[in-house]
Interface confidence: low
């Protein structure tokens, strides 16, 4: 998929692209191809639609093989009645500095959240809201009974005075992680994303994982028992190898997939886990990608509409969101 080979185009004539999909030159300047759309997998040879402000997000500089088409501008955020652009930072109050990242808001507290233990010169620390000050501050109360000082010092430990523990880099971080978005494909290999600041420097970052709700070639409706309307998690007879842009998983997996219903309900993953999967490509390169593995599925009427560009936003509820 790199540009080192001479141009070899799949067809001499330009391909016919679906309505609304741009016809562009591939990343090697060789062949005219249909541009990849938001959330789709992209490579150097399969570029994203530039007319929609999309770029191929490879995740890390080391991985230049397969990325996900991402909006340059990202989805805006609505927070406290105001609309913020992706990447825009704002103060939601004097206590929090927030950032909008592709439709999700993450906030970092501006006020110190340190813990103060009793010490000889401040045996009874207490946080109070002082007039004209935004952040609460520590004050040292005088004990009513001087003899109470002794037991209070039992909690004072010498090691607490020897500087900050490097593992406490995030002491001032209000850790927030959105739920994983719905898989971008209802069948076959897709992408699921989330936003988190659960990292060393409390920076908002977008994470992605591969996902497969069900294989496209499986005719699951055939397996629905008589009198039943759904098959929630059909048994997949044999272990499978996952395929990703011409690369194949090194191991086989006995994965669970979600089934289908005949009464208008849709079955989607309910409980999932994320595991790394190694893919081997025809040029011998091995790449590791995180992938969703389904534990349980649920069948329900809350089905996202086909081709709904806001589909993934329905799943963007923040854990511990302050709104």
């Amino acid at each position: 998929q790199d540009c080192s080979a001479q141009c070899q185009c799949a067809a001499e004539a330009a391909p016919h692209c679906p309505a609304g999909v741009s016809l562009v030159l591939d990343g090697c300047g060789c062949c005219r191809v249909c541009a990849k759309q938001l959330g789709e997998l992209c490579t150097e040879r399969d570029p994203c639609d530039p007319h929609k402000g999309l770029f191929c997000d490879f995740g890390s500089p080391a991985n230049r093989k397969i990325g996900v088409c991402t909006a340059k501008d990202g989805a805006p955020c609505v927070f406290g009645g105001s609309v913020y652009r992706s990447g825009e930072s704002f103060q939601s109050s004097c206590k929090y500095q927030c950032t909008c990242l592709d439709g999700a808001v993450g906030c970092v507290p501006l006020c110190s959240m340190d813990v103060r233990l009793p010490s000889p010169d401040c045996p009874f620390p207490r946080r109070v809201k002082l007039p004209g000050k935004c952040c609460e501050e520590w004050v040292c109360d005088e004990p009513k009974d001087r003899t109470a000082v002794g037991p209070a010092l039992a909690a004072y430990r010498l090691e607490d005075t020897f500087g900050p523990d490097p593992t406490m880099m995030r002491a001032n971080c209000l850790v927030q992680t959105t739920e994983w978005s719905a898989c971008s494909k209802t069948c076959g290999m897709g992408i699921s994303t989330r936003v988190t600041n659960d990292n060393t420097f409390c920076r908002l970052e977008k994470q992605s994982r591969l996902c497969m709700v069900r294989p496209c070639e499986a005719d699951l409706e055939e397996n629905i028992k008589k009198g039943k309307k759904c098959i929630r998690t059909p048994k997949i007879a044999k272990p499978v190898k996952f395929e990703l842009s011409g690369c194949t998983s090194v191991k086989t997996y006995r994965a669970k997939f979600c089934g289908v219903c005949t009464d208008g309900r849709c079955c989607t993953p309910h409980r999932t886990t994320t595991l790394p999967v190694e893919f081997k490509c025809p040029d011998g390169e091995i790449m590791k990608k995180n992938m969703m593995f389904i534990k349980t599925c649920a069948c329900h009427y809350n089905c996202p509409g086909d081709n709904d560009i806001f589909e993934s936003l329905y799943y963007r509820k923040m854990y511990g969101d302050m709104a």
Partner: antibody, heavy 114, light 110 residues
Framework: EVTLKESGPVLVKPTETLTLTCTVS????????VHWIRQPPGKGLEWLGV???????DYNAAFMSRLTISKDTSKSQVVFTMTNMDPVDTATYYC????????WGQGTTVTVSS | ETVVTQEPSFSVSPGGTVTLTCRSS?????????ANWVQQTPGQAFRGLIG???NRAPGVPDRFSGSILGNKAALTITGAQADDESDYYC?????????FGGGTKLTVLG
């Protein structure tokens, strides 16, 4: 012009080791991988292995224990080594460029006989 | 063991169209099998025609095209010519290795 040329012994004794060299021109071994394929007399093609442009190798599982492919990019040479040769290994051995097996060498016929 | 099967022989009239196929013993052929088609001329020389399912090698005329038809890889030759009379081999990639088919001997009648 892209060319590949195999060279090596035409006769090998059973149990001996076969070493063939594929010398390429018109392209760089850091840009394209090279495959090794053989064709026994009157039969079809059998894929043996490949050395990719980044130096990784893949082998036909049936020959994994006997086969080694290496390269010297600066000399534009790929070296193919097969140990413990047997009369059934008598064939014409080819190297071919990766990328649709688009260019092939003319082949070198190797006979395994005592 | 994975087996790749091709029609042993095929014939076509000059100017006619012929489609040679390549079947995998372990399921449908997909683009991830990177189907390759190689021509061996009567003089024993090899040249690659198609790589990566449908990409023509340099210098290959557009009479040759590669595709996936149903669950098989296919090589279609339109406007067949006398010098297309050759053996045609397909090769499929399976994660760590290629497997060649047994080859198809194409005869151009006349």
């Amino acid at each position: 012009e892209v060319t590949l040329k195999e060279s090596g012994p035409v006769l090998v004794k059973p149990t001996e080791t076969l070493t063939l060299t594929c010398t390429v021109s018109g392209f760089s071994l850091s840009t394209f991988g090279v495959h090794w394929i053989r064709q026994p007399p009157g039969k079809g093609l059998e894929w043996l292995g490949v050395i990719w442009r980044r130096g990784g190798t893949d082998y036909n599982a049936a020959f994994m224990s006997r086969l080694t492919i290496s390269k010297d990019t600066s000399k534009s040479q790929v070296v193919f080594t097969m140990t413990n040769m047997d009369p059934v290994d008598t064939a014409t051995y080819y190297c071919a460029r990766d990328g649709g097996f688009d260019y092939w060498g003319q082949g070198t016929t190797v006979t395994v006989s005592s | 063991e994975t087996v790749v099967t091709q029609e042993p022989s095929f014939s076509v009239s000059p100017g006619g169209t012929v489609t040679l196929t390549c079947r995998s013993s372990i399921g449908a052929v997909t683009t991830s099998n990177y189907a390759n088609w190689v021509q061996q001329t009567p003089g024993q020389a090899f040249r690659g025609l198609i790589g990566g399912t449908s990409n023509r090698a340099p210098g290959v005329p557009d009479r040759f095209s590669g595709s996936i038809l149903g669950n098989k890889a296919a090589l279609t030759i339109t406007g067949a010519q006398a010098d297309d009379e050759s053996d045609y081999y397909c090769a499929l990639w399976y994660s760590t290795h290629y497997v060649f088919g047994g080859g198809t001997k194409l005869t151009v009648l006349g």
